[in-house]
């Protein structure tokens, strides 16, 4: 699997999409996990509804939400109020039994807000009580990581 890079701005929302073959993965729940190290396990962050037929319903864990268009074959993950610690490698997964097939490998990059919002007193930040539906979603910038490309080039 190639890695697809999704870039979002700190404090805003980032939408990650993972397309898949809807027939190949018919009946299978999906999950979003965070890769712990290069060879480490992928730690489950959130998964779709326990009943596959209700996969279209949004499920959330903290600031991360997931929804699955099982007919169209697109899994969508929304990371709300993006923070620097959200940067890293993730996977979209298709679950069957206790096994998980990787649908897409994702690198999330968090960009500093070009406008220094932290100094603005009148900035609205979605609170924990706000729903994901209300959150403003920035269209993410995504690209595929080229083979052999270093995601975070060392600074000299």
């Amino acid at each position: 699997h190639n890695t697809t890079v999704f870039q979002g701005v700190e404090g805003q929302s980032l939408q990650v999409s993972c397309p898949y073959d809807s027939m190949k993965h018919w009946g299978r729940r999906k999950a979003w996990c965070r890769q712990l190290g290069e060879k480490g396990p992928c730690q489950r962050v959130v998964s779709t509804h326990n009943l596959w037929l209700l996969s279209f319903l949004r499920r959330r864990n903290g600031s991360t939400a997931i929804t699955d268009d099982t007919l169209g074959g697109t899994l969508t993950i929304t990371l709300r109020n993006l923070q620097p610690h959200d940067a890293g490698f993730y996977q979209c997964q298709s679950l069957h039994g206790s096994e998980a097939d990787t649908l897409r490998k994702v690198l999330v990059e968090v960009l500093a807000d070009p406008l220094d919002h932290r100094d603005a007193g009148d900035l609205w930040v979605p609170g924990e009580s706000e729903s994901f539906e209300d959150a403003h979603v920035e269209h993410s910038i995504s690209r595929s990581l080229l083979e052999g490309e270093i995601p975070f080039p060392p600074t000299s």
Epitope: M23, H96, G97
Partner: antibody
Framework: EVQLVQSGAEVKKPGESLKISCKGS????????IAWVRQMPGKGLEWMGI????????RYSPSFQGQVTISADKSISTAYLQWSSLKASDTAMYFC????????????????WGQGTLVTVSS | DIQMTQSPSSVSASVGDRVTITCRAS??????LAWYQQKPGKAPKLLIY???SLQNGVPSRFSGSGSGTDFTLTISSLQPEDFATYFC?????????FGQGTKLEIK
Amino acid sequence: EVQLVQSGAEVKKPGESLKISCKGSGYSFTSYWIAWVRQMPGKGLEWMGIIYPGDSDTRYSPSFQGQVTISADKSISTAYLQWSSLKASDTAMYFCARQRTFYYDSSDYFDYWGQGTLVTVSS
Amino acid sequence: DIQMTQSPSSVSASVGDRVTITCRASQGISSWLAWYQQKPGKAPKLLIYAASSLQNGVPSRFSGSGSGTDFTLTISSLQPEDFATYFCQQADSFPRTFGQGTKLEIK
């Protein structure tokens, strides 16, 4: 009616190659995984591997990896199991089976089976 | 690999009897288990999936139960056509593995 029809019995000598087939009908062949299962004489069932004919994604049991090749030709709705060099220990009945995912528990089981192909390897 | 162990290996019973076959997994497999029936010279037939769900067309005298590591297949009232070999199979992880089989014979 869903059907998996397998090729006929084969008698081969050790070292020979062989390719057996499993033709699906009565359903969308490219939309279901197909598994191959071995049953040695008087013994139990052994899962060999699986293929998704839609894109030829294949998984093998470690016990059979490198021993056999699983392939499919979606244009003729047929899955294959092949050996490049048979051994006497390959003598067995080989079944193909359609794997169906049941959305109740997001796992998969074998709901339709072929009639089996008996392979006999003897010098 | 997950080992599946069935007991007994064979059982003799009469028409009308209630028969229970057990299957134990070497590690927890939730409810990801199937039961198949196989008659001599024939392909296996799916009876039960997800440990307790009856496959379409299978008589209601067949039932399955259990989760984790211990599972049972019960035939409430044996019919002549039920004499066959029964296999359990885990659908938890690759490679898929089957029990060694339980042969159900006429007493």
